[in-house]
């Protein structure tokens, strides 16, 4: 073509894959009439007619562009839709009159690659390898043109380094014309790289400018020999009996060696292997004082069969022994004195406290409780608490029952019980004393005795309410070798005037309790029995 050497550089049109390229014919009016133009695509220096414009009307030529071309801007612009990578070529428009002139357009196509996918070498890398080993592979799919890859370690770009770092990249062309880039990073790693963060970055261009995409960060398993093993105990701090204690072996090698935990036998001084769980952890639950002692860990490298021993670690499980109170079951006369002594052993300094069991009142701070001029009311429970102030929750207690010799003690002399005739009453009578009293009733009925504690007894009587019973009332008599005492239960007939709105006189079994510990008024509910003559 005459004068081709002097042709100006083609106009550059940049477009992303899938969008529409607007190819504007740049011929001036003097160079040609735009109402009569031919459009060509140039591929490998071969021109192919793809579109004709005649009297401002466009017509596609059969072929690959037939469906994607249209005329815009009053015939000056050819629109190419659904741009693909294969469309990256030169397009030219040629005016036919007054003389043949042409205008060239270079179409550049771009496509951002997908997010880079990074896969770490799952087998890991030994630190003593002779040449760079595969660390990770980075794949950038469906980009155009081929993106550039940069590898980073701990945020710093990696450069090729002989025998140390090698980056091996390759690409494949998909049927779509897009490129998939694969880059393999190979490196010689050191122990310190066990925590190193690697990632790859894809650099690519779009019509809007330069861009980049980063992969996620990965760490690669780095294998290095164990140099040291040690023991770790959880929880940290002071341990006490009852705690859940975990003793685990740790090593500075990867993979860790095979661990075993031993405890020194205090008698033989020999190390005896302990049984660990599946994770190699020795779990002491609940921890006991016998678990105290010297523990050590052995790490055996199954590849080299080299064995390493940890520094021994002393484990102290703090304890408070069973608390002993003497005398253990004191019996005293009224007016006498009593000294209660509390003893316990512990791995730490102990504090003692004496409390009254019934009230929780602190009576004494110290191991000895002295009680003088004992009254009957002084009988009952006293609790010694032995605790380790430096270890919250570490304490043991012992309850001692002080028995004061005396005749039975009734809480009341008399009580009124509301009843109806021909009802079965359930009456209760409770008495305390030392020795423990027995209870008898002055009427026939079904009586049962229940021991409440060493000095207290409860007797229950089921009795039918008769006119005679209403007249005499019911007496319960508690006796022991030191004397006897009586409580009287007066029975009063319920009638409409004595009923209060909240009275319950219709259901259940009548109950009346005479107890040293019950001060409330008795209530009475009852159930009707058949008339006496109808009972077999």
């Amino acid at each position: 073509v005459p004068g081709e050497a002097e042709q100006p550089a083609p106009e550059l049109v940049e477009v992303e894959v899938g969008s529409t390229a607007l190819l504007k014919c740049g011929l001036s009016q003097s160079q040609g009439n735009l109402s009569h133009v031919d459009w060509f695509s140039v591929h490998k220096e071969k021109r192919t007619l793809i579109f004709r414009v005649r009297q401002g009307q466009g017509q596609s030529e059969p072929g690959e562009y037939e469906q994607r071309l249209s005329l815009q801007d009053r015939g000056a612009t050819l629109a190419l839709t659904q741009v693909t990578p294969q469309d990256e070529r030169i397009f030219l428009c040629q005016g036919k009159r007054p003389r043949s002139q042409e205008y060239r357009i270079q179409l550049r196509v771009y496509k951002a690659p997908e997010e880079p996918n990074i896969q770490v070498n799952p087998l890991g890398i030994p630190v003593n390898s002779k040449e760079p080993e595969e660390v990770a592979t980075c794949v950038g799919r469906n980009g155009y043109p081929i993106p550039q890859v940069i590898w980073y370690k701990n945020g710093r770009p990696l450069k090729e380094e002989k025998n140390r770092v090698h980056i091996q990249s390759s690409q494949t062309v998909e049927s779509s014309g897009l490129y998939t880039l694969q880059s393999i990073l190979k490196a010689q790693l050191v122990k310190e790289d066990k925590d190193a963060q690697f990632y790859c970055e894809l650099n690519y261009r779009l019509p809007s400018g330069n861009h980049m995409k980063e992969s996620r960060e990965v760490t690669v398993p780095v294998f290095y020999p164990t140099e040291k093993v040690w023991l770790e105990v959880e929880p940290v701090g002071m341990l006490k009996e009852g705690d859940r204690v975990e003793i685990r072996c740790l090593a500075d090698g990867n993979p860790p060696p095979h661990f075993s935990i031993s405890k020194q036998n205090p008698s033989t001084r020999e190390a005896e292997e302990e049984t660990t769980n599946d994770n190699g952890v020795l779990v002491l639950e609940p921890a006991r004082k016998e678990h105290s002692g010297r523990y050590e860990c052995q790490g055996l490298d199954l590849d080299t069969m080299i064995s390493l021993l940890s520094e021994p670690q002393e484990l102290l499980v703090n304890y408070v022994s069973d608390v002993r109170v003497s005398p253990a079951a004191p019996e005293r006369q009224e007016g006498s004195s009593l000294t209660l002594t509390c003893e316990a052993e512990s791995s730490q300094d102990l504090e003692f406290q004496w409390l009254r069991e019934e009230t929780g009142q602190v009576l004494e701070r110290g191991p000895v409780l002295q009680l003088h001029d004992l009254k009957r009311e002084a009988g009952g429970g006293y609790r010694c608490v032995a605790s380790v102030p430096s270890i919250p929750g570490l304490n043991r207690t012992q309850l001692v029952n002080v028995a004061i010799f005396g005749p039975p003690w009734m809480a009341f002399k008399e009580r009124k019980v509301w009843v109806k005739e021909n009802m079965v009453l359930n009456l209760s009578c409770e008495a305390s004393g030392h020795p423990r009293p027995t209870i008898s009733w002055n009427v026939n009925g079904t009586a049962s005795e229940q021991d409440q504690d060493p000095q207290r007894v409860l007797s229950t009587l089921n009795v039918l309410v008769t006119p005679e019973l209403l007249e005499t009332g019911v007496e319960c008599t508690a006796s022991n070798d030191l004397g006897k005492n009586t409580s009287i239960l007066f029975l009063e007939l319920v009638n409409l005037t004595t009923l209060t709105p909240d009275s319950n006189t219709t259901t259940g079994l009548s109950t009346s309790t005479a107890s040293p510990h019950t001060r409330a008024n008795s209530t009475s509910t009852e159930r009707k029995l058949p008339e006496p003559e109808s009972r077999g």
Epitope: L399, F405, D481
Partner: antibody, heavy 118, light 111 residues
Framework: QVQLVESGGGVVQPGRSLRLSCATS????????IHWVKQAPGKGLEWIAR????????YYNEKFKGKFTLSVDKSKNTAYLQMNSLRAEDTAVYYC???????????WGAGTMVTVSS | DLQMTQSPSSLSASVGDRVTITCRAS??????????MHWYQQKPGKAPKLLIY???NLESGVPSRFSGSGSGTDFTLTISSLQPEDFATYYC?????????FGQGTKLEIK
């Protein structure tokens, strides 16, 4: 220190009676119970009865009721076991023992041997 | 009556051995934390001697190698390390109700 000393044992003919004594010292006699326990030759221990010197209240093992009687002399701090209508099966060592209100025997006498034989 | 069954009736052991004697009551002898079971040692020609009272309390002056345990109906006397002076007959006794009864005894002999 607390001591209990039995006396009054010996050989006695069947059908006769015997009174055993238990002299106490070293504690307040009326504050504790006195029990009598029988041990036949080569056999185990058998509880007979108890007495509370403070009130003279007694309880007997049904097996010995009517045959044996307990009593005390507070002025002498001494307890007694009266044994009537003795038979060969009453041959045994008889112990007196002291207790509090939980009825365990913390102090025992050395025992006195009673042999019923014609 | 409440029956006491002691086992074994006799036992041979050596000095230093740990020995356990059990006593079973025909019904519970315990009341809210107190077990009315006691243990005695008797040597030939001597009176019984109180070792353990209320199931687990060591009588004053008794060596700590003796211990008692149990509640309800089943009780144990343990001698942690037999000494030559421990060869004797041992009795359990309940005081839960009248009449008080003793076990038939366990004779502990030198092996």
């Amino acid at each position: 220190q607390v001591q209990l000393v039995e006396s009054g044992g010996g050989v006695v003919q069947p059908g006769r009676s015997l009174r055993l004594s238990c002299a106490t010292s070293g504690y307040i006699f009326t504050n504790y119970w006195i029990h009598w326990v029988k041990q036949a030759p080569g056999k185990g221990l058998e509880w007979i009865a108890r007495i509370y010197p403070g009130t003279d209240i007694t309880y007997y093992n049904e097996k010995f009721k009517g045959k044996f009687t307990l009593s005390v002399d507070k002025s002498k701090n001494t307890a007694y076991l009266q044994m009537n209508s003795l038979r060969a099966e009453d041959t045994a060592v008889y112990y007196c023992a002291r207790s509090g209100g939980y009825w365990y025997f913390d102090v025992w006498g050395a025992g006195t041997m009673v042999t019923v034989s014609s | 009556d409440l029956q006491m069954t002691q086992s074994p009736s006799s036992l041979s052991a050596s000095v230093g051995d740990r020995v356990t004697i059990t006593c079973r009551a025909s019904k519970s002898v315990s009341i809210s934390g107190y077990s009315y079971m006691h243990w005695y040692q008797q040597k030939p020609g001597k009176a019984p001697k109180l070792l353990i009272y209320l199931a687990s309390n060591l009588e004053s002056g008794v060596p700590s190698r003796f211990s008692g345990s149990g509640s309800g109906t089943d009780f144990t006397l343990t001698i942690s390390s037999l000494q030559p002076e421990d060869f004797a007959t041992y009795y359990c006794q309940h005081s839960r109700e009248l009449p008080y009864t003793f076990g038939q005894g366990t004779k502990l002999e030198i092996k």
